[in-house]
Amino acid sequence: ALDTNYCFSSTEKNCCVRQLYIDFRKDLGWKWIHEPKGYHANFCLGPCPYIWSLDTQYSKVLALYNQHNPGASAAPCCVPQALEPLPIVYYVGRKPKVEQLSNMIVRSCKCS
Amino acid sequence: ALDTNYCFSSTEKNCCVRQLYIDFRKDLGWKWIHEPKGYHANFCLGPCPYIWSLDTQYSKVLALYNQHNPGASAAPCCVPQALEPLPIVYYVGRKPKVEQLSNMIVRSCKCS
C-alpha cells in the first residue's frame, strides 16, 4: 500500500503520500481554531505508471493507453485513498467546543 | 456536475471530462476483442482551483492551502467520479462471449 509507513521511509518517485504540514492561520486563514495550531495533512504526488496501485479498471486502461501514447495528456493521477479525521478545539465565546473533522489527513494514495 | 453534458458543450478550462477515443488494438494492444473495435473512454483534465467540485474536506483544505501557497506542488487533482461499464464481445474458440467490463467509461470528474 502507498501509505505513510512505506512512503515516508522510502525515496519512492512514483505516486506516494508525501509529508505536508498545514498551519491553520498562515496557510488557510482560519484564525479561530484554538488547538491544534496546525496539523500533518500530507498530500499525494508522483507519476502513475502502468500497474502502479491502479484504482479501477479504467485507470488500468488509461495507464496502458499512456504506455502506448507517451505524449498524451490523458494519464491517471495520484490522489488520496485513505483519509483520517482530525479533532479540533475552538471557542464559542468563553466556551470550548471540540469537533471531529472528517477526511482531513491523508494516510495513503492511489492512482485514479 | 462536471459531466459529459456540461463539459462536452463548454470550453471549460478547469477540471472537466474530456473526449478520448481508445482503439483496443492500437492503443492497448488488445487484439482479441472482437466488438467494439474501440470506445469513448474519456478522461479528466484541468486545474482544480478553490471551490471547483471538491470531493472531500481534505480537498477543500488542499485547494485553500494552494490559494495561500500558489507555488506549492500540493494541489487537488482532476480524476474520474462517475464511471460506466462497457459491453464487449470476444471469441473463445468459435464461441462468442459477451462480457460487461465495469468502470470503463468516464461520465464525470471531481477534484480529489
Epitope: L28, G29, W30, K31, W32, Y90, Y91, V92, G93, R94, K95, K97, E99, L101, S102 | Y50, I51, Q57, K60, V61, L64, Q67
Partner: antibody, heavy 121, light 107 residues
Framework: EVQLVQSGAEVKKPGASVKVSCKTS????????MNWVRQAPGAGLDWMGQ????????NYNEMFEGRVTLTADTSTSTAYMELSSLRAGDIAVYYC??????????????WGQGTLVTVSS | DIVMTQTPPSLSVSPRETASISCRAS??????????MHWYLQKPGQSPQLLIY???NLESGVSDRFSGSGSGTDFTLRISRVEANDTGVYYC?????????FGQGTK
C-alpha cells in the same frame, strides 16, 4: 469587492417554513463564519446563529428553539437559513453577515441587504 | 446570557458637536486581554455597518471622527464633529459569551 446578496421578500402562512439564501462573492467563502441576524419591525438586532461553510459546523441561539437550520453550499458560495413553524412574531428582516474572522463568535464586517419575511394567514 | 443596555435610547445632536453613547454589559466582556465589544451604525433603510472592533479599533474605511473606549462592563462610542450623514441607530454588540448579543440601540 465583498458582496452578500440575499434572496427576495417572502410571504408565508403560519406554521410554514421559509428558506432565505445569501450568495457571496469577493472573498473565500470557506474562510469565514457566516452569521444570521434578524430585526423585527422597529426593533433591535437578534443573533440567530452561525455556520462555518467549510464543513458545516453550526452554533445556534437557543432562543430559536431548534426552529432554525443553517446550511451552506461551497460549490456556489451560498449560505442558507431555514426557519420552520413560522408565527406572527417571526415577521422581520433577516440578514446574513460575515464574521470578522478572528473568532467563531465575532463582530460582523459585511452584511447582506436583508430579506423581509412576512407571516400572514 | 449577557444583556447589553444602551443609553440614551435616543439623542439629538447639532452639526459639528460631539455625541456620546454608552453601553453597559450585565457582566464583564473582557477575556485574554481583549474587550469583546463592537459598535455598528444602521442608517435608515440600510443594513448595519461595523464602526469599531474590540472596543477601540476603528474599522477600515470608517471616518476617524468615530472612536470607542472602555473595558469590563462599561463602554462608550464618541462621534466628534457630527454630520447629518451620521443619522441612524447605533448598536453595541458583545461576543465574549454565547449567545452573541446586541444592545437595544440608540437613535
Amino acid at each position: 469587492e465583498v458582496q452578500l446578496v440575499q434572496s427576495g421578500a417572502e410571504v408565508k402562512k403560519p406554521g410554514a417554513s421559509v428558506k432565505v439564501s445569501c450568495k457571496t462573492s469577493g472573498y473565500i467563502f470557506i474562510t469565514y463564519w457566516m452569521n444570521w441576524v434578524r430585526q423585527a419591525p422597529g426593533a433591535g438586532l437578534d443573533w440567530m446563529g452561525q455556520i462555518f461553510p467549510a464543513w458545516g459546523s453550526t452554533n445556534y441561539n437557543e432562543m430559536f428553539e431548534g426552529r432554525v437550520t443553517l446550511t451552506a453550499d461551497t460549490s456556489t458560495s451560498t449560505a442558507y437559513m431555514e426557519l420552520s413553524s413560522l408565527r406572527a412574531g417571526d415577521i422581520a428582516v433577516y440578514y446574513c453577515a460575515r464574521g470578522y474572522g478572528n473568532y467563531a463568535l465575532d463582530a460582523m464586517d459585511y452584511w447582506g441587504q436583508g430579506t423581509l419575511v412576512t407571516v400572514s394567514s | 446570557d449577557i444583556v447589553m443596555t444602551q443609553t440614551p435610547p435616543s439623542l439629538s445632536v447639532s452639526p459639528r458637536e460631539t455625541a456620546s453613547i454608552s453601553c453597559r454589559a450585565s457582566e464583564s466582556v473582557d477575556s485574554y486581554g481583549n474587550s469583546f465589544m463592537h459598535w455598528y451604525l444602521q442608517k435608515p433603510g440600510q443594513s448595519p455597518q461595523l464602526l469599531i472592533y474590540l472596543a477601540s479599533n476603528l474599522e477600515s474605511g470608517v471616518s476617524d471622527r468615530f472612536s470607542g473606549s472602555g473595558s469590563g462592563t462599561d463602554f462608550t462610542l464618541r462621534i466628534s464633529r457630527v454630520e447629518a450623514n451620521d443619522t441612524g441607530v447605533y448598536y453595541c454588540q458583545q461576543n465574549d459569551e454565547d449567545p452573541l448579543s446586541f444592545g437595544q440601540g440608540t437613535k
